[in-house]
């Protein structure tokens, strides 16, 4: 076990941060919940404090969520692929580009650490180049989210990951809009860390609204994963 | 804004159980992270356990762990604090209290950081 991974073995509360701006409309998200990692469970609910999100919802739940991977789920086997975990608690700096297909981008930077006993997720995001009646700023995108599956690989150069993948958001009209991330993970702290074999986490993410809220917000329940790497030739033959 | 009426105290003996209730008017109780405090006679107001909204992050002072559980259900607005093996230390007046759920962790022991307070209710427990 990392010794930042023994900060993760019960229910851990959770603080997200953001302030955008998304073709100059500028907003902010506060989200609170707590994270299981045992589980790989997530509860998440976030407010614009903004008033209303200039955004839709889905577009954000990677740079909230996919932001506090170290929530993931890491069977037995995979334990040592666990680069989130083992950046704690200083915790990593996470950089991502979107791009949304036939329409712009968001650029994110992030950092994801514990202060005192509540992991932290303080995120900045510019976005250029939307179309202002396109799926994202034209708010035509429907209000769920699909299971995806985020690849890493290890980046020995900056002593971190790098992470990709492909989100498919669900759009009214019965279509879908694209969105390719590019994602880099750096440790904050000069501890060692774990750099893992190529593997994957595979999430499931529903999305849901709190009746009695009257701000603009999203309520999100996600379960994560480790997966594909295979347990060695030892552990068959045991 | 949300506001407290706590219920359940009383007088037991050494060993009884209680069960505490508190039940929230004015606002939506999901909206806060809650907790117990409680004032022994003669002494400051101390912390006993938080809960977060969801119900399942849960935090207890050392001296109340494995005896009391705290638990909620916001379908019922209310909060509760299932008290087990009291002792004569256990005499108290127990306070509900809750903080806005977004921009403040559950995980908080301090007093200040609870901005809505019950009126109390008296629980002694007697050799």
């Known amino acids: 076990m990392s010794k930042g991974e023994e900060l993760f073995t019960g229910v851990v509360p959770i603080l997200v941060e953001l302030d955008g701006d998304v073709n100059g409309h500028k907003f902010s998200v506060s989200g609170e919940g707590e994270g299981d990692a045992t589980y790989g469970k997530l509860t998440l609910k976030f407010i614009c404090t903004t008033g209303k999100l200039p955004v839709p919802w889905p577009t954000l739940v990677t740079t909230f969520s996919y932001g506090v991977q170290c929530f993931s789920r890491y069977p037995d086997h995979m334990k040592q692929h666990d680069f989130f975990k083992s950046a704690m608690p200083e915790g990593y700096v996470q950089e991502r580009t979107i791009f949304f297909k036939d329409d712009g981008n968001y650029k994110t930077r992030a950092e994801v650490k514990f202060e005192g006993d509540t992991l932290v997720n303080r995120i900045e995001l510019k976005g250029i180049d939307f179309k202002e009646d396109g799926n994202i700023l034209g708010h035509k995108l429907e209000y769920n989210y699909n299971s995806h599956n985020v690849y890493i690989m290890a980046d020995k150069q900056k002593n971190g990951i790098k992470v990709n993948f492909k989100i498919r958001h669900n759009i009214e009209d019965g279509s879908v809009q694209l969105a390719d991330h590019y994602q880099q993970n750096t440790p904050i702290g000069d501890g060692p860390v774990l750099l893992p074999d190529n593997h994957y986490l595979s999430t499931q993410s529903a999305l849901s609204k709190d009746p009695n809220e009257k701000r603009d917000h999203m309520v999100l329940l996600e379960f994560v994963t480790a997966a594909g790497i295979t347990h060695g030739m030892d552990e068959l033959y045991k | 804004q949300v506001q407290f009426v706590e219920s359940g105290g009383g007088t037991v003996q050494d060993g009884d159980f209680l069960r505490l209730s508190c039940t929230a008017s004015?606002?939506?109780?999901?909206?806060?992270?809650a907790g117990w405090f409680r004032q022994p006679p003669g002494r400051e107001r101390e912390f006993v356990a938080a809960i977060s909204w969801t119900g399942e992050g849960t935090l207890y002072a050392d001296s109340v762990k494995g005896q009391f559980t705290i638990s909620r259900d916001n379908a019922k607005n209310a909060m509760y604090l299932q008290m087990n093996r009291l002792k004569p230390e256990d005499t108290a007046v127990y306070y509900c209290?809750?903080?806005?759920?977004?921009?403040?962790?559950?995980?908080?022991?301090?007093?200040?950081?609870?901005?809505?307070w019950g009126q109390g209710t008296q629980v002694t427990v007697s050799s």
């Open positions: 004015g606002d939506t109780f999901s909206n806060y992270h």
């Open positions: 209290a809750a903080a806005r759920s977004v921009g403040f962790t559950w995980r908080s022991s301090k007093s200040n950081d609870y901005a809505y």
